[in-house]
């Protein structure tokens, strides 16, 4: 007989999700309208393509990247889509309320959809640390809290530190990673006896995770350049991201082989390390003046990613209860920090070059920005973790962790699914 949600969740989830959706529809009805300004169709299509790239990254890239669990691949992909769809809606409203609302209605443009998709991506990065241990009702809470926290962080950084869209969105890596890790820390950790096999990866889901990694790899230049101001900045960002991810692939595969006693390549290492360069150059992708620098960063990022994948999972599994294959959280936390440090180093070099105290002050501001992003991520993550532990959500029992059968109807249930 197929497994079902507990009765209470069957009442709670549809009611909670549909009520929320109805509330969002009402908010859109009363407070938003489309940008009615004239724009040529060619330009519109070009602008839409960037948003499309971001959606592909989110839905297919991150959706499949998290699907490597042996018995949790369906849930990983579908829950990601659910969170993306919900997250984009809430992010559009929130960004509008925070930045435009005093002037009247929220105007929805292709740029606001682009921003919202990037905000929702944050949730998809974070959720990697908790997928398999939470149900959809809990994920709805996580989406709402994280998108709200990120939106407010970006607004505060924009107003206090005077940073542009690109700079404040590039905190997403660090923010998402620390948010996810702090939520995971709050959830019940030990996997009970008899469920150890469920958080193992299987060949076909691992292949789909590799497919996700490939999609992310292809579209990462679009992500890093999406919010930049001029064609020259975007061009430099695309080039540098491409060089960095290209080198991180080579580093990931060879580094993975080097890290194994028999010289074998680990799928898990490769899944995450291929993206390492893109994350590391994110903040300063438009500032790097030549390919060799981007390539060096890709190399360093690849090595850090492989090193992290080798030595951190044990610690993460013990302390945070994160399975070995869910390495996006600590991977992004390390690489996001690397990216932020690179940007700060560039500012320090400016200070040395100019001998100017004001630029030194800029370095302090950037450190302050980074610290604020981490603090807000940790605090909102802990708050989310505590909320998710409430009994009302009817969280899956530990024995049902990483199990698609808890959530999905399968016509023929094979034991080894």
């Amino acid at each position: 007989m197929s497994s079902k949600y507990p009765r209470s969740v069957r009442r709670c989830l549809p009611l909670w999700a549909l009520t929320l959706e109805a509330a969002l529809i009402l908010l859109f009805y009363f407070f938003t309208h489309y940008d009615a300004s004239l724009e040529d169709q060619k330009g519109l299509v070009a602008s839409y393509q960037v948003g499309q790239d971001l959606t592909v990254m989110a839905a297919i890239g991150l959706g499949f990247l998290t699907s490597s669990f042996r018995r949790h691949s369906w849930s990983s992909v579908a829950f990601n889509l659910f969170m993306l769809a919900l997250g984009v809606q809430w992010a559009i409203l929130l960004d509008g309320f925070l930045s435009q609302f005093p002037s009247g209605k929220v105007v929805i443009t292709l740029f606001s959809i682009r921003l919202a998709t990037m905000s929702a991506l944050s949730v998809l990065i974070s959720v990697d640390a908790v997928l398999g241990k939470v149900n959809l009702a809990q994920l709805v809470v996580m989406v709402l809290v994280e998108v709200t926290a990120l939106g407010n962080l970006r607004m505060v950084i924009s107003n206090i530190f005077n940073t542009d869209y690109h700079m404040n969105m590039m905190h997403i890596y660090v923010f998402a990673a620390y948010f996810g890790l702090s939520v995971a820390w709050c959830l019940p950790k030990p996997l009970p006896e008899g469920t150890e096999d469920k958080d193992q990866t299987a060949t076909i889901p691992s292949l789909s995770a590799m497919l996700g990694a490939l999609f992310l790899w292809m579209f990462w230049p679009s992500f890093n350049s999406a919010l930049l101001r001029s064609p020259i900045e975007r061009k430099n960002a695309v080039f540098n991201t491409y060089y960095a991810v290209a080198v991180s692939v080579v580093t990931a595969i060879s580094g993975s082989s080097l890290a194994h006693p028999q010289g074998k390549i680990s799928k898990t290492y490769v899944h995450s390390a291929v993206l390492a360069g893109g994350v590391a150059v994110g903040t300063s992708c438009h500032l790097i003046p030549s390919p060799w620098l981007a390539m060096v960063l890709g190399l360093v990022a690849g090595l850090i990613s492989v090193g992290g994948a080798k030595y951190l999972p044990g610690c993460c599994n013990r302390v945070l209860g994160i399975p070995h294959s869910s390495i996006m959280g600590y991977n992004f936390s390390l690489l996001g920090l690397l990216g932020e440090i690179i940007y700060i180093v560039l500012l320090v070099l400016d200070t040395v070059g100019a001998g100017n105290g004001m630029i030194g002050f800029q370095v302090l501001l950037s450190i302050g920005e980074l610290s604020l992003a981490i603090v807000i991520a940790l605090m909102s993550g802990l708050l989310t973790g505590l909320l998710l532990n409430l009994k009302i959500w009817k969280a899956p029992h530990e024995a049902k962790y990483f199990d698609d059968q808890v959530f999905w109807k399968f016509p023929h249930l094979a034991v080894g699914f």
């Epitope: 724009e39 443009t109 005077n162 001029s230 300063s284 560039l346």
Partner: antibody
Framework: QVQLVESGGGVVQPGRSLRLSCAAS????????MHWVRQAPGKGLEWVAI????????YYADSVKGRFTISRDNSKNTLYLQINSLRAEDTAVYYC??????????????????????WGQGTTVTVSS | DIQMTQSPSSLSASVGDRVTITCRAS??????LNWYQKKPGKAPKLLIY???SLQSGVPSRFSGSGSGTDFTLTISSLQPEDFATYYC??????????FGGGTKVEIK
């Protein structure tokens, strides 16, 4: 040569709407951000709005948010400013300006500086009952 | 928004004089500062970008300096065609570009 020509100004009653246009020529319009800047009689220059090269993003001065809409049609090499709910304080000469990105680099980083390098002659908007 | 304060608001000078106009930002704008010249009935003209870089076609008697919050426009030897109003403008915060109040340079 590079040229910007504004049009659409005139005498309008308070509360009415107006649409200003700026026709660009002599450069690749779709590669540059564009601005509207105004100067009220006896006052200084006041920045009004910017639109990015691809039209994807727009920013407005706090004083005009919600009433003014900047847009562009790259296929027609034209910039627009839609002004709604006109007030007496909107009386000014409105200039459109091309934004140029000045790009330089050292061995370790790129620098991008932006300035309005080409301006139109302006169009006058007078709000009066 | 970042406030830009120019001083003096007006000055009288003679042809051949060295003229200095200062501009102060309410917070650090690094080198993101431009200077414009505006004559009555004419369009503004870009003189200096990035605090000290001379726009092509602008005479070398114009120069700019400064970074952070304090900036200066200097006209080394004032010419008859230089009598105009000069504006500084910060380009550090794209979301809210701001001009200084202007400095009117008049004939003594």
């Amino acid at each position: 040569q590079v040229q910007l020509v504004e049009s659409g100004g005139g005498v309008v009653q308070p509360g009415r709407s107006l649409r200003l246009s700026c026709a660009a020529s002599g450069f690749t319009f779709s590669s540059y951000g564009m601005h509207w800047v105004r100067q009220a009689p006896g006052k200084g220059l006041e920045w009004v709005a910017i639109i990015w090269f691809d039209g994807s993003n727009k920013y407005y001065a706090d004083s005009v948010k919600g009433r003014f809409t900047i847009s562009r049609d790259n296929s027609k090499n034209t910039l627009y400013l839609q002004i709604n709910s006109l007030r007496a304080e909107d009386t000014a000469v409105y200039y459109c300006a091309k934004e140029h990105g000045y790009y330089s680099s050292s061995w370790y980083r790129n620098y991008y500086y932006y300035a309005m390098d080409v301006w139109g002659q302006g169009t006058t908007v007078t709000v009066s009952s | 928004d970042i406030q830009m304060t120019q001083s003096p608001s007006s000055l009288s000078a003679s042809v051949g004089d060295r003229v200095t106009i200062t501009c102060r930002a309410s917070q650090s704008i690094r080198r993101y500062l431009n200077w414009y010249q505006k004559k009555p009935g004419k369009a503004p003209k870009l003189l200096i970008y990035a605090a000290s870089s001379l726009q092509s076609g602008v005479p070398s008697r114009f120069s700019g300096s400064g970074s952070g919050t304090d900036f200066t426009l200097t006209i080394s030897s004032l010419q008859p065609e230089d009598f105009a109003t000069y504006y500084c403008q910060q380009s550090y915060r794209t979301q809210g570009l701001t001009f200084g109040g202007g400095t009117k340079v008049e004939i003594k």
